[in-house]
């Protein structure tokens, strides 16, 4: 492979916004390799050497009127200006999350399981995910992947609930996000749809069988009684 | 008080590769970068270009200054080179996986420097290039880098995928595997027994009941026919 030594220069101009643009902090930072050498901090008002390597730059830039003036004005001319340019499609961007619930392991009822609430494709990243069991919030046994940035202006997160599902229980994943006015909810019932249909089929079949058997026996025995007694007199035609 | 938002103009210049980058970052997401070869602004999402504009020439001027500054700093540091920091790699999907439902595999390459990586997608061990996309090098708060690579795919139980990453900080290429984890159905024993028994009993009941009904009806019919002439 290519084993030549590498040398990296990394300038970063950072604008930190608090309460919209009410308070703004501007940082003009310079990194040689991975080490910051010199920076301008609007809270300080002049360039400062971070390491000895940056001392000549701090001294020179502080002496340069244009450079210093520009850095000092940057909270307005650069930060607030750029915020105004991008605000509509960044600060105000809203994408609704897609919520799905599924068990992570295919376990029978009354066995330990992890219920997964998958929340995906949302923006911005601020989100609140809660689990409810039969309407009561579950605070213990929650595990989360944390916020995952997809790199395409969407986020995802998985919030798992450790539980032992019992028949008839209703689990609800509730999601609060700036893109929606009221919370999104997705339910999961402790018995699966296939299990439920199997139970219904079994019980339904059993009941139907009993009905048929009962009806058959009733008709059969009613007619059986008629054989031992007198036959009714036929009507004359 | 924690800040609400951060906008970063991040640049770098790397020698001897002579590679440079200029990008704007909003809360960790790329707004745009400048394609140095094409000398044009590339918006991360196409619609961003409808709301704003950026003169790519300004970025090229910055990169020229960065190149000059790197040479000064390299000399000043007595040619101290960067220490390679190997990446951490994670493969995940864009959304929950469903068979034959289009999805996207994401290869997240994180916490590395210098900003040079070679990334390959493998399907069943063979390189895939169709539909793949990637981000530029994204800045981190610790001044290392992040990068995303994407592969659109159709989930199936037959295919396995790998994201193969090469970096000077790694002794050998790093492979991160992904395959479809088909959920095995629940062993619904109780339900199966109830269903089987219920249907069996039901079927038997229906058959026997039907026989009794038929016999009962026949008997009643026969008795009617035996009335006075």
């Amino acid at each position: 492979g290519d084993t030549r030594p590498r040398f990296l220069w990394q300038p970063k101009r950072e604008c930190h916004f608090f309460n919209g643009t009410e308070r703004v902090r501007f940082l003009d930072r310079y990194f040689y390799n991975q080490e910051e050498s010199v920076r301008f901090d609007s809270d300080v008002g002049e360039f400062r050497a971070v390491t000895e390597l940056g001392r000549p730059d701090a001294e020179y830039w502080n002496s340069q009127k244009d450079i210093l003036e520009q850095a000092r004005a940057a909270v307005d001319t650069y930060c607030r200006h750029n915020y105004g340019v991008v605000e509509s499609f960044t600060v105000q961007r809203r994408v609704q999350p897609k919520v799905t619930v599924y068990p992570s392991k295919t376990q029978p009822l009354q066995h330990h399981n992890l219920l997964v609430c998958s929340v995906s494709g949302f923006y911005p990243g601020s989100i609140e995910v809660r689990w409810f069991l039969n309407g009561q919030e579950e605070k213990a046994g929650m595990v989360s992947t944390g916020l995952i940035q997809n790199g395409d202006w969407t986020f995802q997160t998985l919030v798992m609930l450790e539980t032992v599902p019992r028949s008839g229980e209703v689990y609800t994943c509730q999601v609060e996000h700036p893109s929606v006015t009221s919370p999104l909810t997705v339910e999961w019932r402790a018995r699966s749809e296939s299990a439920q249909s199997k139970m219904l089929s079994g019980v339904g079949g059993f009941v139907l069988g009993l009905l048929f058997l009962g009806a058959g026996l009733f008709i059969y025995f009613r007619n059986q009684k008629g054989h031992s007694g007198l036959q009714p007199t036929g009507f004359l035609s | 008080i924690k800040e609400e938002h951060v906008i970063i103009q991040a640049e770098f210049y790397l020698n001897p590769d002579q590679s440079g980058e200029f990008m704007f970052d909003f809360d960790g997401d790329e707004i745009f970068h400048v394609d140095m070869a094409k000398k044009e602004t590339v918006w991360r999402l196409e619609e961003f270009g409808r709301f704003a504009s950026f003169e790519a020439q300004g970025a090229l001027a910055n990169i020229a200054v960065d190149k000059a500054n790197l040479e000064i700093m390299t000399k000043r540091s007595n040619y101290t080179p960067i220490t390679n920091v190997p990446p951490e790699v994670t493969v995940l999907t864009n959304s929950p996986v469903e068979l034959r439902e289009p999805n996207v595999l994401i290869c997240f390459i994180d916490k590395f420097t210098p900003p040079v990586v070679n990334v390959t997608w493998l399907r069943n061990g063979k390189p895939v290039t169709t539909g793949v996309s990637e981000t530029v090098f994204l800045p981190r708060e610790d001044h290392l880098f992040r990068k995303f690579h994407y592969l659109p795919f159709l989930p199936s139980t037959e295919d396995v995928y790998d994201c193969r990453v090469e970096h000077w900080g790694l002794d050998e290429p790093l492979l991160k595997h992904w395959e479809f984890d088909a959920p095995s159905p629940l062993p619904e024993t109780t339900e199966n027994v109830v269903c089987a028994l219920g249907l069996t009993v039901g079927l038997v009941g229906i058959i026997i009941g039907t026989i009794f009904i038929i016999k009962g009806v026949r008997k009643s019919n026969a008795a009617e026919r035996r009335g006075p002439l």
Epitope: S42, S63, K65, D66, L68, Q70, R72, V75, D76 | -
Partner: antibody
């Protein structure tokens, strides 16, 4: 029309503090396109810039290295004025002291990309003698 | 600190003459230079900023030129009210510095 009006004693004893104020009319000390300077003139030194104060979202001060250890320039927004304090004076500090507005001309009138400058408004000057 | 050297230190001229004053900087200052006129007992008055931009209200007979280290103030046709001392000042770097002055006297 912008005007600057000086006030302060004309005689200061050595080792004491020289204090001058400059009242602004027709502009604001918090202006976003100006800085407020103190300059002195003496036969031996000629015109000498001492320092300045100005506002750009916060207050900034810049001082000449020759006086940095003993100078303070303060803005007073309530009175729309700014002051000069020069500590530990010596006869060498005897001079005519001027306050002046440095105008930040917009990039459209300058050769360069950002600003260009000129001391476009001056006070009438105050003669300060340091003597016991 | 950047030194500004003005030449000549004094000159004698007549009304209607074309007068040229030079200012040399000890290092490059781009176009960050201003010219002032000062009359005895008065404060300096701004004539030119950014090396060649004429301050509003200043007669057009005054002009400035130059960039880097060499600058010139020209009075195309000297008027009686122009007899004064002229100073250059640099705005490139701190501390801000002035030239030693050029006294324009009546011949």
């Amino acid at each position: 029309q912008v005007q600057l009006q000086h006030s302060g004693p004309g005689l200061v004893k050595p080792s004491q503090t020289l204090s001058l104020t400059c009242a602004i009319s027709g502009d604001s000390v918090s202006s976003n396109s100006a800085s407020w300077n103190w300059i002195r003139q003496s036969p031996s030194r000629g015109l000498e810039w001492l320092g300045r104060t100005y506002y750009r979202s916060k207050w900034y001060n810049d001082y000449a290295v020759s006086v940095k250890s003993r100078i303070v320039i303060n803005p007073d927004t309530s009175k729309n004025q700014f002051s000069l304090q020069l500590n530990s004076v010596t006869p060498e500090d005897t001079a005519v002291y001027y306050c002046a507005r440095e105008n930040f001309y917009g990039s459209e009138t300058c050769h360069k990309k950002y600003y260009c400058y000129g001391m476009d408004v001056w006070g009438q000057g105050t003669t300060v003698t340091v003597s016991s | 600190a950047i030194q500004l050297t003005q030449s000549p230190s004094s000159l004698s001229a007549s009304v209607g003459d074309r007068v040229t004053i030079t200012c040399r900087a000890s290092q490059g200052i781009s176009s960050a230079l201003a010219w002032y006129q000062q009359k005895p007992g008065k404060a300096p008055k701004l004539l030119i900023y950014d090396a060649s931009s004429l301050e509003s209200g200043v007669p057009s007979r005054f002009s400035g030129s130059g960039s880097g280290t060499d600058f010139t103030l020209t009075i195309s046709s000297l008027q009686p009210e122009d007899f004064a001392t002229y100073y250059c000042q640099q705005f490139n770097s701190f501390p801000l510095t002035f030239g030693g002055g050029t006294k324009v006297e009546i011949k």
